[in-house]
Interface confidence: medium
Amino acid sequence: IPAPSIRLVPPYPSSQEDPIHIACMAPGNFPGANFTLYRGGQVVQLLQAPTDQRGVTFNLSGGSSKAPGGPFHCQYGVLGELNQSQLSDLSEPVNVSFPVPTW
């Protein structure tokens, strides 16, 4: 099933101690899906979208950037025929970096 879209959303982090907010959204015909956020191939967080919504926002606490490296991806799962879980393709990667202080 089609990949979700993924995006870093405001407020953006300015240091590694700041929280990171990543939104993930399934296509229009998949509301209420279960979403998984990955970083460097490892599961970071799981969230379920409300039954009338197509997306979730992962709120990662400060210091999450020190977790295993690599970009973030997300994926969603829905119940298909015979109540079997179907997993989407992985989203495109999204990168997180921190602005260089301009003092």
Epitope: Y12, P27, R54, S97
Partner: antibody, heavy 120, light 110 residues
Framework: QVQLVESGGGLVQPGRSLRLSCAAS????????MHWVRQAPGKGLEWVAV????????YYADSVKGRFTISRDNSKNTLYLQMNSLRAEDTAVYYC?????????????WGQGTLVTVSS | QSALTQPRSASGSAGQSVTISCTGT?????????VSWYQQFPGKAPKLLIY???HRPSGVPDRFSGSKSGNTASLTVSGLQAEDEADYYC??????????FGGGTKLTVL
Amino acid sequence: QVQLVESGGGLVQPGRSLRLSCAASGFTFSSYGMHWVRQAPGKGLEWVAVISYDGSNKYYADSVKGRFTISRDNSKNTLYLQMNSLRAEDTAVYYCASEGVDFWSGLDYWGQGTLVTVSS
Amino acid sequence: QSALTQPRSASGSAGQSVTISCTGTSSDVGGHNYVSWYQQFPGKAPKLLIYEVSHRPSGVPDRFSGSKSGNTASLTVSGLQAEDEADYYCSSYADLNNLMFGGGTKLTVL
């Protein structure tokens, strides 16, 4: 106060290139996602592209994908739009706009726009 | 990337209320709350009026309000004033990286 000032527009022949700039001041430019939105004469608004606060993630409208490139220089507080292989239908006023500080809080600041005319 | 559907024009007398609709699909307006409204005067840049369906930025009069039902978002201008005469655009995300605008509605104050 927040100011976004676009420049670089003008008359250009089809197939040629142009680079637009958007100079930002009055806010911490490096902390905000930035968009380009255009408006053809007498027509509605059309989203063109967005770039993340740090420049690492970029997304484009299908109509410009592969021809336009959005970029930014946070050390100069400047947003750019490199437009290649221009077509007559790219004729429009091009606005730069900043994302809000809150989650999906809309495009809260806009420049005054710069007119790009593609004609032979 | 088809535009969201808005009426081409709307009108109302001074002091009255007028509502402008913005119809999309379950893939955009109906699938989340990321709907914004903008006001634009001729020859000027757009100005943000409403974000996340119903939130007003500071400085926007409370005469402007937003709502959503199903796949349709609405902007209501109550207590119409002459200076409200302008073009109004709705906006929504088709996916997280694809912003869409409505075709625009010209509001006339009679």
